[in-house]
């Protein structure tokens, strides 16, 4: 394809560009402590960092967004770092009938890209 | 569910929160003028605006990201406004054998959410 390809080396320096980072959070932090029982502490992978021109572009839209941001920065925002995929996790819930194991498919990020 | 639901009214005032906006761009703007023949001018819908707490949350991850951003703003970024779906468009290409019509599924945003 004649498209510019998304690049993977960060021109801003190590750890500055869009990447996955682990954030520890308690059920209290999430406001879930009255209905999730366990685990009380979660390891949440989140997408953080900047999206310089064509870095990890999610798709064609993200590539043109990056280009137009360069031309019209006040009108078109830069792409931003968001999850490209998720890792399922299981939490123990308090329910009316007791306790159940519930899967969350969209809670913890597994990969990131610039969209 | 006991989750806080994504909200749809913008607390920042009209037009300030994440929404779809049309941006006009030429093939020259996109750097495509040597291999796309037509149309020369594109109407590109893009996602712009802010993502205040729980506004149009894409999923559970976005909800907890919003919450953790409130608690640890230096460590966890706020959710940002990105496409939730796309509208396919057809462009006319110059090829080695002449001209062809090519569909782009991920060029023009159709809806936006906060991720």
């Amino acid at each position: 394809s004649a498209h510019a390809h998304p690049r993977d080396s960060c021109p801003l320096g190590p750890g500055r560009c869009c990447h996955l980072e682990t954030v520890q959070a308690t059920l209290e932090d999430l406001g879930w402590s009255d209905w999730v029982l366990s685990p009380r502490q979660l390891q949440l992978s989140m997408c953080v960092g900047e999206c310089p021109h064509l870095y990890r572009s999610a798709n064609t839209h993200a590539q043109i967004k990056a280009r137009l941001h360069g031309l019209q920065p006040d009108k078109v925002p830069a792409p931003c770092c968001v999850p490209s995929s998720y890792t399922p996790v299981v939490l123990m819930h308090r329910t009316d009938s007791g306790v159940s194991l519930q899967t969350y498919d969209d809670l913890v990020a597994r990969g990131c890209h610039c969209a | 569910s006991a989750h806080a639901h994504p909200r749809d009214s913008c607390p920042l005032g009209p037009g300030r929160c994440c929404h779809l906006e049309t941006v006009q761009a030429t093939l020259e703007d996109l750097g495509w003028s040597d291999w796309v023949l037509s149309p020369r001018q594109l109407q590109l819908s893009m996602c712009v605006g802010e993502c205040p707490h729980l506004y149009r949350s894409a999923n559970t991850h976005a909800q907890i990201k919003a919450r953790l951003h409130g608690l640890q703003p230096d460590k966890v970024p706020a959710p940002c406004c990105v496409p939730s779906s796309y509208t396919p468009v057809v462009l006319m290409h110059r090829t080695d054998s002449g001209v062809s019509l090519q569909t782009y599924d991920d060029l023009v945003a159709r809806g936006c959410h906060c991720a």
Epitope: L37, S38, P88, V90, R94, G98, V99, L101 | -
Partner: antibody, heavy 119, light 107 residues
């Protein structure tokens, strides 16, 4: 490092009760649940139930309901499993194990406590 | 309750062999399957969790795959210390249930 240390072997008569302890160290006891699993001689693993150390909520295996009680003492980071009305087929090694974690992992196990039920 | 069926119940193999153990759930359990190794007189040891994630400190010759109802544990090159009994376990829903075990013996 994370450890679960269980109480010593017990010999009980049919109809009696036994209470096995499991002391946790190396992590925040109230962050995770504790499972109890038993294994009769030469047999496979049988899950008995689960307790969350934080709130004391429990889930018990149907076949043990009414005979088993799981408790925790957060001041000493210790979990307990009491089994009443013992029968000879309750003779087994009883294990405590931490979890499930957010990836459904039951990752750290106690060394096991042998309970023999014999007249 | 979800039944977990392991096969074979025993396997004879030599050092260096590739060994595959399968586990079938009576209903879908997503990827919430773990594999344990147990040696005589010892507590079970977690090898694989979430169907394919290798527990910290476990040698890379152990691998897991599968989702839904069918799962596999593979030992790529059997070592002397791998002769043991292996159990699968589901944690998709309570009650948590284990497979019947597979004994890996020296040929």
């Amino acid at each position: 490092q994370v450890q679960l240390v269980q109480s010593g072997a017990e010999v009980k008569k049919p109809g009696a009760s036994v209470k096995v302890s499991c002391k946790a160290s190396g992590y925040t006891f109230t962050d995770e649940g504790i499972n109890w699993v038993r294994q009769a001689p030469g047999q496979g693993l049988e899950w008995m139930g689960w307790i969350t150390a934080y709130s004391g909520d429990t889930v018990y295996a149907q076949k043990l309901q009414g005979r088993v009680t799981m408790t925790t003492d957060t001041s000493t980071s210790t979990a307990y499993m009491e089994l009443r009305s013992l029968r000879s087929d309750d003779t087994a090694v009883y294990y405590c194990a931490r979890g499930p974690g957010q990836y459904a992992d039951v990752d750290v196990w106690g060394q096991g406590t042998m309970v023999t039920v014999s007249s | 309750d979800i039944q977990m069926t392991q096969s074979p119940s025993s396997v004879s193999a030599s050092v260096g062999d590739r060994v595959t153990i399968t586990c079938r759930a009576s209903q879908g359990i997503s990827s919430w399957l773990a594999w344990y190794q147990q040696k005589p007189g010892k507590a079970p040891k977690l090898l694989i969790y979430a169907a394919s994630s290798l527990q910290s400190g476990v040698p890379s010759r152990f691998s897991g795959s599968g989702s839904g109802t069918d799962f596999t544990l593979t030992i790529s090159s059997l070592q002397p210390e791998d002769f043991a009994t292996y159990y699968c376990q589901q944690a998709n829903s309570f009650p948590i249930t284990f497979g019947g075990g597979t004994k890996v013996e020296i040929k």
